[in-house]
Interface confidence: low
C-alpha cells in the first residue's frame, strides 16, 4: 500500500537557527521515510532534507540548517513520503520567511514608576539578540495586579533598533504591584516569541483613596456620657498597598459646630464619649501626598427611635462559604452594614464589619472564620445617614464535638426518683450549637438507660428507679458533629422515703 499523501504542511523559521516543517500523518502503518524538497533564493536554488531512515523513520518533521537559510526569501516546500510500495508527493506549499519567522522573547530589565506621573509604570526591555536588525517588532505586553489571576494585554510596535526599548503603561491603579510579561514578533510574522520572564513593578503612591467608617454604640455610663467606638478602614477598591500616616477625626453635636472636637490618631479605632444628643463625626486619612475624601457618620440621639425593616435572616453554608441572607420590608434601603465577631464569654478580641450595597446577602469565605467558633452576625439597614435596628443570628462554619461535657449533680434523691441538674457548657468549649442533652444512667450490674432532652433543658427528673440501688450517670451534650460526656456521678436511691421514715419515728 502506498503511503498516505503528506498533508497539513506547516513551516516555521526559527530566526538564525533553523527552518522546520512538519506534516501529517505523523505515523504510518508501514515503515515510511520522507524527503522534503525545498526551493530557495527566490527559486534559484533547491535542496532536500531527509528524515534519517535508521533513527527517524515515520518522523513527520525535518529541519534545514544554516548556512543555506536565506532571509528575506520565499521558499517552496514539497514533502515526499516513501515506503516499500512506492512514493506519494504532497502538494507544493509556498512560504514567505518574513511571515513565519519566530524570534526569542525580549527581556524586561526595569519596571518602575516615573517620578510625578501617577498611575503609570515604565517598562524597559532589551530586544532579543536574535532578531532581524532592520525589522519592526510587534509586542504584546501582558499585565495583572499581583493578587489577580486575570491578565490584561496591550499591543504595540517598535521600530527602534539595537537599544533598550521603553513602553509607558498608563491608567493603572495607584500604589499597586503589577506583574508584567512581554512577547514579540517581527511585524509581518504569524508566530510570536515565547513570553519573557515575569517582572514586578509598583505604581506611585497617591493621597489615600477613602475610608469606610462604622461605630459600636455602647450603653450610657452613670454620668450620662455615651461611649461610642469608632472604627474605620480603607474603602473597598482602595489600592492594596495604600498606607496612611494617620487619621484626623472631628465631631460636634448636630447644629453646633462651635463645640467641634478634634482628634489625631494613627490607630484605626477610637473611643468617643458623647452626650445624649445627635452627633456628626468626620474622619479623613492622610499620607505624605495628601488627605482622603471625608467619611461621615451620624450618631443618633440617645432617645431617637430607630427604624426596623429586616424581617428574617438565614445563615447557610456552602462548600467553602458562609452565606447570610435577609428579607426586608423597605425596598428603598439598599445599603447594609454587616458586623461579625466571635461569641465568647469575655469581650470579643476581634470585631469585623463590612458594607453591602445593592444586595440582601453577604458572603464570607469559610477560611476567614475559625472553625468550632460561634460567630454573632448582625445586619444593620442604612438609609442615607440613618442606621436602623439590627437583626442578628449566630453561625458556625464548622462544628465539632464539645471539648467538655456538662458538669452534673444529683439532687432530691428519692426511693424511685432523682432530679439531675447540669450546667451549660462554657461558650469556648461548645464547638457547635448544642442540639440536645442525653442522660445515660445504669444500675449497678444492670442495663443502661438513656433519655434525650432539648438543649434548653438543664434539669430532669428520672423516675421508675429501683429502691436502695447504686446508679452511675452522665450527661452527654451533642452538636451536629457528635456528643461529649460530662463527668460521671454516682448516687444511691433511698430504701425508704424521708416522709415514711419520719412517720415511722413518730410511732
Amino acid at each position: 500500500v502506498l503511503p498516505a499523501k503528506p498533508e497539513n504542511i506547516s513551516c516555521i523559521f526559527y530566526y538564525e537557527e533553523n527552518f522546520t516543517c512538519t506534516w501529517s500523518p505523523e505515523k504510518e502503518a508501514s515503515y515510511t521515510w520522507y524527503k522534503v524538497k525545498r526551493t530557495y533564493s527566490y527559486g534559484y536554488k533547491s535542496d532536500i532534507c531527509s528524515t534519517d531512515n535508521s533513527t527517524r523513520g515515520n518522523h513527520a518533521s525535518c529541519s534545514f540548517l544554516p548556512p543555506t537559510i536565506t532571509n528575506p526569501d520565499n521558499y517552496t516546500i514539497q514533502v515526499e513520503a516513501q515506503n516499500a510500495d512506492g512514493i506519494m508527493k504532497s502538494d507544493i506549499t509556498y512560504w514567505n520567511l518574513d511571515a513565519i519567522m519566530k524570534i526569542e522573547p525580549p527581556e524586561i530589565f526595569s519596571v518602575k514608576s516615573v517620578l510625578g506621573i501617577k498611575r503609570m509604570l515604565q517598562i524597559k526591555w532589551i530586544r532579543p539578540v536574535l532578531a532581524p536588525h532592520s525589522s519592526t517588532l510587534k509586542y504584546t505586553l501582558r499585565f495583572r495586579t499581583i493578587n489577580s489571576a486575570y491578565w490584561m494585554e496591550v499591543n504595540f510596535t517598535k521600530e527602534d533598533i539595537d537599544r533598550d526599548e521603553t513602553y509607558n503603561l498608563t491608567e493603572l491603579q495607584a500604589f499597586t504591584e503589577y506583574v508584567m510579561t512581554l512577547r514579540c514578533a517581527p511585524a509581518e510574522s504569524m508566530f510570536w516569541s515565547g513570553w519573557s520572564q515575569e517582572k514586578v513593578g509598583t505604581t506611585e503612591e497617591e493621597a489615600p483613596y477613602g475610608l469606610d467608617l462604622w461605630r459600636v454604640l455602647k450603653p450610657a455610663m452613670v454620668d450620662g456620657r455615651r461611649p461610642v467606638q469608632l472604627m474605620w478602614k480603607k474603602a473597598t477598591g482602595a489600592p492594596v498597598l495604600e498606607k496612611a500616616l494617620g487619621y484626623n477625626i472631628w465631631y460636634f453635636p448636630e447644629n453646633n459646630t462651635n463645640l467641634t472636637e478634634t482628634v489625631n490618631t494613627t490607630n484605626q479605632t477610637h473611643e468617643l464619649y458623647l452626650g445624649g444628643k445627635t452627633y456628626w463625626v468626620y474622619v479623613v486619612s492622610y499620607n505624605s501626598l495628601g488627605e482622603s475624601p471625608v467619611a461621615t457618620l451620624r450618631i443618633p440621639a440617645l432617645n431617637e427611635k430607630t427604624f426596623q425593616c429586616i424581617e428574617a435572616m438565614q445563615a447557610c453554608l456552602t462548600q467553602d462559604q458562609l452565606v447570610v441572607e435577609w428579607q426586608s420590608s423597605a425596598p428603598e434601603v439598599d445599603t447594609w452594614m454587616v458586623e461579625w465577631f466571635p461569641d465568647v464569654d469575655s469581650e470579643p478580641s476581634s470585631f469585623s464589619w463590612e458594607s453591602v450595597s445593592q444586595a440582601r446577602n453577604w458572603t464570607i469565605q469559610k477560611d476567614e472564620l475559625k472553625p468550632l467558633w460561634c460567630y454573632n452576625i448582625s445586619v444593620y439597614p442604612v438609609l442615607r445617614d440613618r442606621v436602623g435596628q439590627p437583626y442578628s443570628t449566630q453561625a458556625y462554619v464548622q462544628e465539632g464535638i464539645p471539648s467538655a461535657g456538662p458538669v452534673t449533680q444529683a439532687d432530691s434523691i428519692g426511693v424511685k426518683t432523682v432530679t439531675i441538674t447540669w450546667k451549660e457548657i462554657p461558650k469556648s468549649k461548645r464547638n457547635g450549637f448544642i442540639k440536645n442533652y442525653t442522660i445515660f444512667y445504669q444500675a449497678e450490674d444492670g442495663k443502661e438507660f438513656s433519655k434525650t432532652v432539648n438543649s434548653n433543658i438543664l434539669q430532669y427528673r428520672l423516675e421508675s428507679l429501683t429502691r436502695r440501688t447504686s446508679y452511675s450517670l452522665q450527661v452527654m451534650a451533642s452538636t451536629n458533629a457528635g456528643g461529649t460526656n460530662g463527668t460521671k456521678i454516682n448516687f444511691k436511691t433511698l430504701s425508704i422515703s424521708h416522709h415514711h421514715h419520719h412517720h415511722h419515728h413518730h410511732h
Partner: antibody, heavy 119, light 107 residues
Framework: EVQLVQSGAEVKKPGASVKVSCTAS????????IHWVRQAPGAGLDWIGR????????KYAPKFQGRATLTADTSTNTAYMQLSSLRAGDIAVYYC????????????WGQGTLVTVSS | DIVMTQTPLSLSVSPGETASISCKAS??????VTWFRQKPGQSPKLLIY???NRYTGVPDRFSGSGSGTDFTLRISTVEADDTGVYYC?????????FGQGTKLEIK
C-alpha cells in the same frame, strides 16, 4: 542582613582566566539582577555587564563581550564573573552589585575583589 | 554608548558651604540617573536614584535634580565626612555608563 560577599584577591599571569564569586545573603538573587563593575587603580567605574539569575540571561558592555562570562547558581545564591585572556589593563578591583528592577538602582555592593595580572 | 561627563573633576569646599556637581549625558536619559559616593578602599554607596530620590538613610543635605541630559547633585552644609569621589551613572540604555567621578575635598 542583606549583603554580597566576594571571593578573595587573585594574582594571574597574562593570558590566563580569573573567576570571581559573589555570594548573597539576606535575599534571593533570583529576584534581582547582579551587575559587575570594575575600577582600575586611581580610575573611575566601568560597567562590565549583568545577569538575571532567574533565567541566566546576560548583557555585556561591548568592550567585554566575548571575554567576560557571567553565570549564577541559584542553589547557592552565588553569582560568578569570569574574565579570560587577561592582560595588564585588566588590573582592577571587580565589584558585584545588586540591581533590583522594581526600584531600579544599585543598592547593595560587594566589598570588591582585587585582580592583579603579572608575569 | 551614552557618555556621562562630570564637572568639575575636583572640588574643594569649606564646612558649612554648598557643593554642586554637574553631570551631562550625551543624549537624553530621561530621569534614569543615580549618584554614588565612594570613599578610599570602600565600595560605592548609593545616594540618589531616579535623578532626585534620596535613598533610605541618606541625609536631606543631599539632593538631586535634573532630567533629560543635565543633572546636578547638591550637598548643602557640607561636613567633613562628605569627602570622597562622587559618581553619576545612567541606567537608561545599556551599556550602563558612569561619569569620570568628582573628588570632593573639605578644606
Amino acid at each position: 542582613e542583606v549583603q554580597l560577599v566576594q571571593s578573595g584577591a587573585e594574582v594571574k599571569k597574562p593570558g590566563a582566566s580569573v573567576k570571581v564569586s559573589c555570594t548573597a545573603s539576606g535575599f534571593n538573587i533570583k529576584n534581582t539582577f547582579i551587575h559587575w563593575v570594575r575600577q582600575a587603580p586611581g580610575a573611575g567605574l566601568d560597567w562590565i555587564g549583568r545577569i538575571d539569575p532567574a533565567n541566566g540571561n546576560t548583557k555585556y558592555a561591548p568592550k567585554f563581550q566575548g571575554r567576560a562570562t557571567l553565570t549564577a547558581d541559584t542553589s547557592t545564591n552565588t553569582a560568578y564573573m569570569q574574565l579570560s585572556s587577561l592582560r595588564a589593563g585588566d588590573i582592577a578591583v571587580y565589584y558585584c552589585a545588586r540591581y533590583y528592577y522594581v526600584s531600579s538602582y544599585f543598592d547593595v555592593w560587594g566589598q570588591g575583589t582585587l585582580v592583579t595580572v603579572s608575569s | 554608548d551614552i557618555v556621562m561627563t562630570q564637572t568639575p573633576l575636583s572640588l574643594s569646599v569649606s564646612p558649612g558651604e554648598t557643593a554642586s556637581i554637574s553631570c551631562k549625558a550625551s543624549q537624553s536619559v530621561t530621569n534614569d540617573v543615580t549618584w554614588f559616593r565612594q570613599k578610599p578602599g570602600q565600595s560605592p554607596k548609593l545616594l540618589i536614584y531616579s535623578a532626585s530620590n534620596r535613598y533610605t538613610g541618606v541625609p536631606d543635605r543631599f539632593s538631586g535634580s535634573g532630567s533629560g541630559t543635565d543633572f546636578t547633585l547638591r550637598i548643602s552644609t557640607v561636613e567633613a565626612d562628605d569627602t570622597g569621589v562622587y559618581y553619576c551613572q545612567q541606567d537608561y540604555s545599556s551599556p550602563w555608563t558612569f561619569g569620570q567621578g568628582t573628588k570632593l575635598e573639605i578644606k
